[in-house]
């Protein structure tokens, strides 16, 4: 018994072959013995299965002698063994029909879980086996899970089912909902304008949902709410806003936030939530904010740095075109009775330069100047 | 009385570079996204490049990436754009815009423009 | 990409006449678009904004309507000032997009 697998909603052709290259007298049956089409001479004619208006043939291949029963719209139910009579032969094929469903939304927000649910004719032991985007393989029976889905996981995963050593592939699109970083860090001297831009990893056409910007500044014992707004259909609309700082928000997407001057008092890490309808759970986003400042006090030239540094960055005081005079893993670095001529505090990584402030120190009679 | 003059405009080889410039005055320039669009008698208008109001966040349409760079000085209250590997199809007139945003959305004020030939 | 379709490419219209000029988009842009005219030997000047607001300064005879895929701008009694490219601009995602523009002419 030949056997042919077929997808819920799909088309699928099976074929029934007469050893005489015309056309003859052909009925398709199934189990039941249930007619479902067969011909009249040149006409196609119907009987009475549940398959009546989505089953077909194909009248121009009968002169070749090919008589195929076409079923539109597959449905589970539609599992069967059909039967083709045809010169006092029968030749019979097993059809089974799968199904393969993601069990919430395909569009899940980043740490959900994706749970993919096989539809399965009774009788049929398939296996199943996915492949994500980023190549990873999961295997399982009438159910697959994948647990803290990541950004990496938004496409289009493939589905292979096993039954009788055929294969039917079903193809599945994801969308993983998160911000494209997880975090980032901003580097500004004091005085500066900041920037804060919240790049979504997806495109969707109707955007809706509320979102707030939570600060904890490094000064500060206590987080506090710098921003609320709202968004209607990739709209930003201010709700409330701190009058210290007086964040601005752009009106456009991606989320774009603008701190009029980077201020020590400013310096730390917030936490940019998105809450979309008709979702449960938040989208987050971590921003850090470093503040530099270069000051020059009687004999004492300082330069600090404020915010979340890690312990590997160097924070270094040097006279332009000459050697470090001091180079520490340290948030605060001076030098005593400083030379005159223009000084650079930096705020190193490995050698790459993060921050840098420019100070100008005038001889001791003078008082110095910030470029 | 919000102000954008563009300057910079040549005949240039094609595969060769510019840079165009656009004075701002009138209005807190540092507030503002600003953006460049080109206008050519058979393609009509084209947004080129959108650079945010502090100047950390760029957007490029897919045709120019790569090839134009938007910058802004913030103290010298001016736009710019380096263009580069030009083509005859970068043959256009060239004008500042201003966003009613400190990011990007519409174009609200407009400079006069100035013309970039490619040719050899 | 959010292409715009603009038509018609040219109208020529009697004074005291009405003019409609439509905008379609390939994507859902709610109501941001936005409309410009602009006279020959100078930049665009900003007539409509999202939402269909009149910009100060616009006479009241110009005036926009739509929302999705589908608008329009209207002057409803033509005067020979009014001669000029007119323009829309969509402004609900990037890339920005213009429509190819509108000659309007008098008859």
């Known amino acids: 018994k030949k056997v042919v697998l077929g997808k819920k909603g799909d088309t699928v052709e099976l074929t029934c072959t007469a050893s005489q290259k015309k056309s003859i007298q052909f009925h398709w049956k199934n189990s039941n013995q249930i007619k479902i089409l067969g011909n009249q001479g040149s006409f196609l004619t119907k009987g009475p299965s549940k398959l009546n208006d989505r089953a077909d043939s194909r009248r121009s291949l009968w002169d070749q002698g090919n008589f195929p029963l076409i079923i539109k719209n597959l449905k589970i139910e539609d599992s069967d063994t059909y039967i083709c009579e045809v010169e006092d032969q029968k030749e019979e094929v097993q059809l089974l029909v799968f199904g393969l469903t993601a069990n919430s939304d395909t569009h899940l927000l980043q740490g959900q879980s994706l749970t993919l649910t096989l539809e399965s004719p009774p009788g049929s032991s398939p296996s199943v086996q996915c492949r994500s985007p980023r190549g990873k393989n999961i295997q399982g029976g009438k159910t697959l899970s994948v647990s803290q889905l990541e950004l990496q996981d938004s496409g289009t995963w493939t589905c292979t089912v096993l039954q009788n050593q055929k294969k039917v592939e079903f193809k599945i699109d994801i969308v993983v909902l998160a911000f494209q970083k997880a975090s980032s860090i901003v580097y500004k001297k004091e005085g500066e304008q900041v920037e804060f831009s919240f790049p979504l990893a997806f495109t969707v056409e109707k955007l809706t949902g509320s979102g707030e910007l939570w600060w904890q500044a490094e000064r500060a014992s206590s987080s506090k709410s710098w921003i609320t707004f709202d968004l209607k259909n990739k709209e930003v609309s201010v709700k409330r806003v701190t009058q210290d700082p007086k964040l601005q928000m752009g009106k456009k997407l991606p989320l774009h936030l603008t701190l009029p001057q980077a201020l020590p008092q400013y310096a730390g890490s917030g936490n940019l939530t998105l809450a979309l309808e008709a979702k449960t759970g938040k989208l987050h986003q971590e921003v850090n904010l470093v503040v530099m400042r270069a000051t020059q006090l009687q004999k004492n030239l300082t330069c600090e740095v404020w915010g979340p540094t890690s312990p590997k960055l160097m924070l270094s005081l040097k006279l332009e075109n000459k050697e470090a005079k001091v180079s520490k893993r340290e948030k605060a670095v001076w030098v005593l009775n400083p030379e005159a001529g223009m000084w650079q505090c930096l705020l190193s990584d490995s050698g790459q330069v993060l921050l840098e402030s420019n100070i100008k120190v005038l001889p001791t009679w003078s008082t110095p100047v910030q470029p | 009385e919000v102000k954008l003059v563009e300057s910079g405009g040549d005949l240039v080889k094609p595969g060769g570079s510019l840079k165009l410039s656009c004075a701002a005055s009138?209005?807190?320039?540092?507030?503002?996204?600003m953006s460049w669009v080109r206008q050519t008698p058979d393609k009509g208008l084209e947004w080129v490049a959108t650079i945010s109001s502090g100047g950390s966040y760029t957007y490029y349409p897919d045709n120019v990436k790569g090839r134009f760079t938007i910058s802004r000085d913030n103290a010298k209250n001016t736009l710019y754009l380096q263009m580069s590997s030009l083509k005859s199809e970068d043959t256009a007139m060239y004008y500042c815009?201003?966003?009613?945003?400190?990011?990007?959305?519409?174009?609200?004020?407009w400079g006069q423009g100035t013309t970039l030939t490619v040719s050899s | 990409e959010t292409t715009v379709t603009q038509s018609p490419a040219s109208l020529s219209v009697a004074i005291g006449e009405k003019v409609t000029i439509r905008c379609i988009t390939s994507?859902?842009?709610?109501?941001?678009m936005n409309w410009y005219q602009q006279k020959p030997g100078e930049p665009p000047k900003f007539f409509i904004s999202?939402?269909?607001t009149l910009r100060p300064g616009v006479p009241s005879r110009f005036s926009s309507s739509g929302y999705g895929t589908d608008f329009v701008f209207t002057i409803e009694n033509m005067l020979s000032e009014d001669v000029a490219d007119y323009y829309c601009?969509?402004?609900?995602?990037?890339?920005?997009?213009f429509g190819s523009g509108t000659k309007l002419e008098i008859k």
């Open positions: 601009l969509q402004s609900d995602t990037l890339p920005l997009t």
């Open positions: 999202e939402g269909n």
């Open positions: 009138g209005f807190t320039f540092s507030s503002y996204g």
């Open positions: 815009a201003r966003h009613e945003d400190g990011n990007w959305n519409y174009f609200d004020y």
């Open positions: 994507t859902d842009i709610d109501d941001d």
